[in-house]
Interface confidence: medium
């Protein structure tokens, strides 16, 4: 912070290191970025609150991220602008420490939320059979709470109490920085923990996700029938959700009246019980067939060689009367877990021949959900998810790298970096909070539509926007 002198009085006059037009420019640019950050993240939060189709586990992570980014937009950005423009810290040591604690805790929480989202996508792709069962609202809440609590524990005590630990406050009244950052090695250590480590983890996760996605797409291309799906190559995943031992009607107990219309079967009490434990997902652009086992008679279930063969898990409970299969070709925008396209969920089994029956049912349904091929299918959902994660990763690296590279250089060469470069680097980290809503939310059509409704004040059917 270059502070010029006012020779007319005896005390040091800490004045702005910038000319008037530069101050106006900085305030306008910083103010605009702050405003965009605030609006973008409020839109994300309000959208999730008002639209029940957006109330999914994945979007709870986004809500937490938006909270962190909103705080950065409201407090961090504006206070840093004030500090930069004036050339000194005008608000005293207490506000300084509170600002720094908030800044670092929230920035770290934002990074941790990015990590959670990356891990979530990673597990969705690599453990499609086991992970979605564990992926509950409660677990999401616990992960989010852990991110915030851990960020708080890591930064707040050190920032607020370091002066008392060492017995002296070395930060002057006109200055505002973390006291223990006086040591370049300590600064670099924190950069490793807050940036380099998360980047390495996120890159490794992305590599695994893209590799898993590519291998799936290759598998799909080998199966000619799969390519008939216009949205993406179909991939069938079977998983047991929960064995249901209630004395529910068996598959042929007079449920034939539930005819499948447009690839969707009306929900019946059996289905509702079957899928109760599941996360509320936005059925954006999805084709789902529910309770089909209940809707098909035994004599209907015949082997069909032209359909995709699936390997389904089976319930060990042989006494379970109920078989419930739910197939859905889901569009995993940012709100659904499985980037696999056709999911088959099997609950319970109908006696000894459960396995065989489930296999045949699944094949039958997969065939039903197929649609005629179109000339140019859009990019597969696997690719879309991979591309979204790449956008997340790149946005994070591009915005956080300059500052952290400077911290690395600074360890070996203290005066090599001018103050203006430090300021730009620091600001770029904040800009990640501006980009995040665009990176995540705008990848999802439901978010886009909800945003539009909110911005145009169309509140009428906003809660059901898909």
């Amino acid at each position: 912070m270059n502070n010029s002198t006012n020779s007319s009085n005896n005390s040091l006059a800490l004045t702005s290191p910038y000319k008037t037009f530069e101050v106006v420019f900085i305030v306008l640019v910083a103010g605009s970025l702050s405003l965009v950050t605030i609006i973008g993240n409020i839109l994300v939060m309000v959208s999730i609150k008002v639209n029940r189709h957006l109330q999914t586990v994945n979007n709870y992570f986004l809500f937490s991220l938006a909270c962190a980014d909103l705080i950065i937009g409201v407090f961090s950005m504006n206070l840093y602008t004030l500090y930069t423009v004036i050339g000194y810290w005008p608000l005293g040591p207490v506000v300084c420490d509170l600002w720094l604690a908030l800044d670092y805790v929230v920035s770290n929480a934002s990074v941790m939320n990015l990590l959670i989202i990356s891990f979530d996508r990673y597990f969705c792709v690599t453990k499609p059979l086991t992970y979605p069962v564990k992926r509950t609202t409660k677990m999401a809440g616990m992960m989010i709470a852990a991110a915030w609590v851990l960020s708080f524990i890591l930064w707040a005590p050190a920032i607020l109490f370091w002066q008392f630990i060492v017995g002296v406050r070395t930060v002057e009244d006109g200055e505002c920085y973390i006291q223990f950052f006086s040591n370049a090695a300590v600064t670099f250590g924190t950069a490793i923990a807050a940036f380099y480590l998360p980047v390495i983890i996120m890159t490794v996760l992305y590599w695994h996700i893209s590799r898993a996605s590519k291998s799936r797409i290759k598998k799909d291309k080998k199966e000619p029938v799969a390519n008939q799906d216009p949205v993406s190559p179909s991939l069938v995943q079977g998983r047991i959700v929960k064995p249901n031992n209630n004395n529910m009607p068996s598959s042929d107990d007079g449920l034939e009246h539930n005819k499948i219309q447009n690839g969707k079967a009306p929900r019946d009490p059996v289905t509702e019980n079957c899928v109760q434990g599941e996360e509320k997902e936005s059925s954006n652009d999805s084709t789902s067939v529910s309770a089909v086992a209940s809707n098909m008679r035994d004599d209907e279930i015949t082997q069909d060689e032209n359909t995709v063969s699936t390997s389904l898990g089976h319930s060990k409970d042989e006494n379970s009367k109920q078989t419930c299969i739910r197939i859905g070709t889901k569009t995993p925008k940012s709100d659904s877990c499985t980037p696999t396209n056709t999911t088959v969920e099997v609950v319970g089994s109908s006696g000894q021949n459960g396995d065989e029956k489930q296999n045949i049912v699944a094949r039958k349904i997969v065939k039903m959900t197929k649609q005629p091929a179109k000339k140019k299918p859009p990019p597969s959902r696997e690719k879309k998810v991979t591309r979204t994660i790449l956008a997340i990763l790149l946005a994070f690296i591009i915005t956080w790298a300059p500052y952290n590279v400077m911290v690395l250089i600074n360890t070996f060469c203290a005066p090599c970096i001018p103050n203006t470069v430090w300021t730009i680097g620091y600001w770029l980290c904040y800009i990640n909070s501006t980009i995040n809503p665009a990176c995540y939310a705008l990848c999802n059509a439901t978010f886009k539509k909800t945003f539009k409704h909110l911005l145009m004040c169309h509140y009428k059917n906003i809660g059901a926007t898909r």
């Epitope: 912070m1 270059n2 502070n3 040091l12 800490l14 002296v168 406050r169 070395t170 930060v171 002057e172 200055e175 920085y177 973390i178 950052f181 006086s182 040591n183 370049a184 600064t187 670099f188 500052y403 400077m406 911290v407 600074n410 360890t411 203290a414 005066p415 970096i417 001018p418 103050n419 430090w422 300021t423 620091y426």
Partner: nanobody, 121 residues
């Protein structure tokens, strides 16, 4: 706020000596690198001498090497500039400068209001 107060300036004959002092009102003086700059009439401000936070490293402008000595007393939060064998071209306003470099933030750069040194021939 950080304040730097220079003293010891005045009128001296060529070949004479002066000792400038700069006292800093800071919490931890040892965190600052200290320096002296000067600005002659109608000239740009120029570097004279500097000393590291611990006092182990010093640096001088070629024009003052062998004549000026910079030192510091961290206990008194004061930096000194001993000027010997003064020349008329040393006439200028002498400014005290304190610099604290914070990793991840850059330089905190402070200046005193200056003290006048006039060397008559």
């Amino acid at each position: 706020q950080v304040q730097l107060q220079e003293s010891g300036g005045g009128l001296v004959q060529a070949g004479g000596s002066l000792r400038l002092s700069c006292t800093a009102s800071v919490r931890t003086f040892s965190n600052y690198g200290m320096g002296w700059f000067r600005q002659g009439p109608g000239k740009e401000r120029e570097f004279v001498a500097s000393i590291s936070w611990s006092g182990t490293m010093t640096q001088y402008a070629d024009s003052v090497k062998g004549r000026f000595t910079i030192s510091r007393d961290n206990a008194k939060s004061t930096v000194y500039l001993q000027m010997n064998n003064l020349k008329p071209e040393d006439t200028a306003v002498y400014y005290c400068n304190a610099v604290k470099y914070i990793p991840g933030r850059g330089e905190y750069d402070y200046w005193g209001q200056g003290t006048q040194v006039t060397v008559s021939s």
